[in-house]
Interface confidence: medium
C-alpha cells in the first residue's frame, strides 16, 4: 500500500470498520499543505477531506467516516490542482479492529476463562497472551469469539494477561493490522494484583498476523 508517485508514500488504516485514516509522507512537499480528495463510488465527483491530520503545521493525512464498508476508496492527493498521488484501494484490506473492551477473568482452580465484548463484525480472532515471571516467553491462545479458556495454570504463580483482536488473514487478506493490546492485568490465586514480581516489561506487540 505504500506505493510511491512523485515520492509520495501512503499508509491506510481502516479503524474497526468505522474510520479510514489515510496518511502520506511526501518529502518533496514537506512544507506544503497537500489536499485530499476522495469518493466511494467510481462515477461520483470527488469530495474534499474535512478532517485533516497535521504534522508540523502541514497536512499529513485525512480521517474519513466509512461505517461498515467493503468497497473501494478512490482518492487523489493534490498540490493545488495538480494531483501528486491518485489511487484506489479496497478499504477492508487495511482493517484494524478496535482493542478488546470489558475484559473479564473467571477462575476455576487451574484454569481461567477470559471474555470480552465481541466486536459487531465477524471473522476475527481473539488472542490472549499470558506469562508468569518464570516464563521466558509469552504463551498464546486464540479463539473465534472472545471466550478463551486457558488450562493448566499454576494456582500459586502470578500471571500477566493481555488481549488483542486480529482479522482472519484467510478472510480479510494479508495486509490487516492487529488491534492494540488491552491493558496488562496481573492475577494470582484468582485475585487481581498490581503487578507480578520480577515480570519483565511486556514486549511490543508483533505486527505479524
Amino acid at each position: 500500500q505504500g506505493g510511491a508517485a512523485e515520492g509520495v508514500q501512503i499508509q491506510i488504516i481502516y479503524f474497526n470498520l468505522e474510520t479510514v485514516q489515510v496518511t502520506w509522507n511526501a518529502s518533496k512537499y514537506s512544507r506544503t499543505n497537500l489536499t485530499f480528495h476522495y469518493r466511494f463510488n467510481g462515477d461520483e465527483a470527488y469530495d474534499q477531506c474535512t478532517n485533516y491530520l497535521l504534522q508540523e503545521g502541514h497536512t499529513s493525512g485525512c480521517l474519513l467516516d466509512a461505517e461498515q464498508r467493503d468497497d473501494i476508496l478512490y482518492f487523489s492527493i493534490r498540490n493545488g490542482t495538480h494531483p501528486v498521488f491518485t489511487a484506489s484501494r479496497w478499504m477492508v484490506y487495511y482493517l484494524k479492529p478496535s482493542s478488546p473492551k470489558h475484559v473479564r477473568f473467571s477462575w476455576h482452580q487451574d484454569a481461567v476463562t477470559v471474555t470480552c465484548s465481541d466486536l459487531s463484525y465477524g471473522d476475527l480472532l481473539y488472542e490472549v497472551q499470558y506469562r508468569s515471571p518464570f516464563d521466558t516467553e509469552w504463551q498464546s491462545k486464540q479463539e473465534n469469539t472472545c471466550n478463551v479458556t486457558i488450562e493448566g495454570l499454576d494456582a500459586e504463580k502470578c500471571y500477566s494477561f493481555w488481549v488483542r483482536v486480529k482479522a482472519m488473514e484467510d478472510v480479510y487478506g494479508p495486509d490487516t493490522y492487529p488491534s492494540d493490546w488491552s491493558e496488562v492485568t496481573c492475577w494470582q490465586r484468582g485475585e487481581i494484583r498490581d503487578a507480578c514480581a520480577e515480570t519483565p516489561t511486556p514486549p511490543k506487540p508483533k505486527l505479524s498476523k
Epitope: F40, N41, E67, Q68, R69, D70, D71, I72, W90, V92, Y93, Y121, G122, D123, D170, V171, Y172, G173, P174, D175, T176
Partner: antibody, heavy 119, light 107 residues
C-alpha cells in the same frame, strides 16, 4: 445455511427491461455484498455488477448505462434491473454472495434465472 | 479488462486420475484467482479462492497453484461427482472476468 433464491420472468420482449429479485437467507445483506453474473453460450460467464454491504454499487462498464442494482436489507432482497434488452442478452442470470472480504470470491450462488429475449 | 484464458475447453479423464486445468491471465493478477465448479444441473460452487485456499466444505483432493499470470487447478483423485465444468475468475481488477471454462468428461 446460506441460500439465494431468484425470481424473475423467463421471457422478455426486445427493448424491454429485465427485473430479477434475489432473496437471501443464512446471512445479512448488511454484512455481505451480492454480485450478479450472467452466462450465455456465446460469451460465457460475465460479471455484471455488485451491491456492497454498505449499499454502494460497482458495475461492469460494458453494462453500466443500463444496469441498476438496489436492495432492501430488512427484506433480505436484492433487486436487479437491466434496461433495453436485446437478443444477445439471452442468458442465465445469477446472484451470488460475496465471500472472503479481502479476496472477492463469490462463495454461494443462486440457482440462476433463465432469460430469453424474444418477441 | 483483464482477459482470462482456459486453453483447454474440454478434457477427458478416468476415475481416479490426477487432472490439471490451466488458466492464464492477460496480466499479472497477484494471486487473486478463484476457481468455480458448475455441475451439469447448472449449480455453481466456489472451490478455491486466492489461488490455493480451499472454500469451506470443498474436498481436499482439490488444490490450486500458480502466480503472476499462470494458474492451475488440480484434482488429485477424480471422482464421479467431479464431472463438471470448471471456471477461473480473476479478482485483482474490476471488472471481474472469467475464463471460458473447461468441461471435464469421463473417458
Amino acid at each position: 445455511q446460506v441460500q439465494l433464491k431468484q425470481s424473475g420472468p423467463g421471457l422478455v420482449q426486445p427493448s424491454q427491461s429485465l427485473s430479477i429479485t434475489c432473496t437471501v437467507s443464512g446471512f445479512s445483506l448488511t454484512t455481505y455484498g451480492v454480485h450478479w453474473v450472467r452466462q450465455s453460450p456465446g460469451k460465457g460467464l460475465e460479471w455484471l455488477g455488485v451491491i456492497w454491504r454498505g449499499g454502494n454499487t460497482a458495475y461492469n462498464p460494458a453494462f453500466m448505462s443500463r444496469l441498476s442494482i438496489t436492495k432492501d436489507n430488512s427484506k433480505s432482497q436484492v433487486f436487479f434491473k437491466m434496461n433495453s434488452l436485446q437478443a444477445d442478452d439471452t442468458a442465465i442470470y445469477h446472484c451470488a454472495k460475496k465471500s472472503y472480504y479481502g479476496y472477492h470470491a463469490m462463495g454461494y450462488w443462486g440457482q440462476g434465472t433463465s432469460v430469453t429475449v424474444s418477441s | 479488462d483483464i482477459q482470462m484464458t482456459q486453453t483447454t475447453s474440454s478434457l477427458s479423464a478416468s476415475l481416479g486420475d490426477r487432472v490439471t486445468i490451466n488458466c492464464r491471465a492477460s496480466q499479472d493478477i497477484s494471486n487473486y484467482l478463484n476457481w468455480y465448479q458448475q455441475n451439469p444441473d447448472g449449480t455453481v460452487k466456489l472451490l478455491i479462492y486466492y489461488t490455493s485456499r480451499l472454500h469451506s466444505g470443498v474436498p481436499s483432493r482439490f488444490s490450486g497453484s500458480g502466480s503472476g499470470t499462470d494458474y492451475s487447478l488440480t484434482i488429485s483423485n477424480l471422482e464421479q461427482e467431479d464431472i463438471a465444468t470448471y471456471f477461473c475468475q480473476q479478482a485483482n481488477t474490476l471488472p471481474w472476468t472469467f475464463g471460458g471454462g473447461t468441461k471435464l468428461e469421463i473417458k
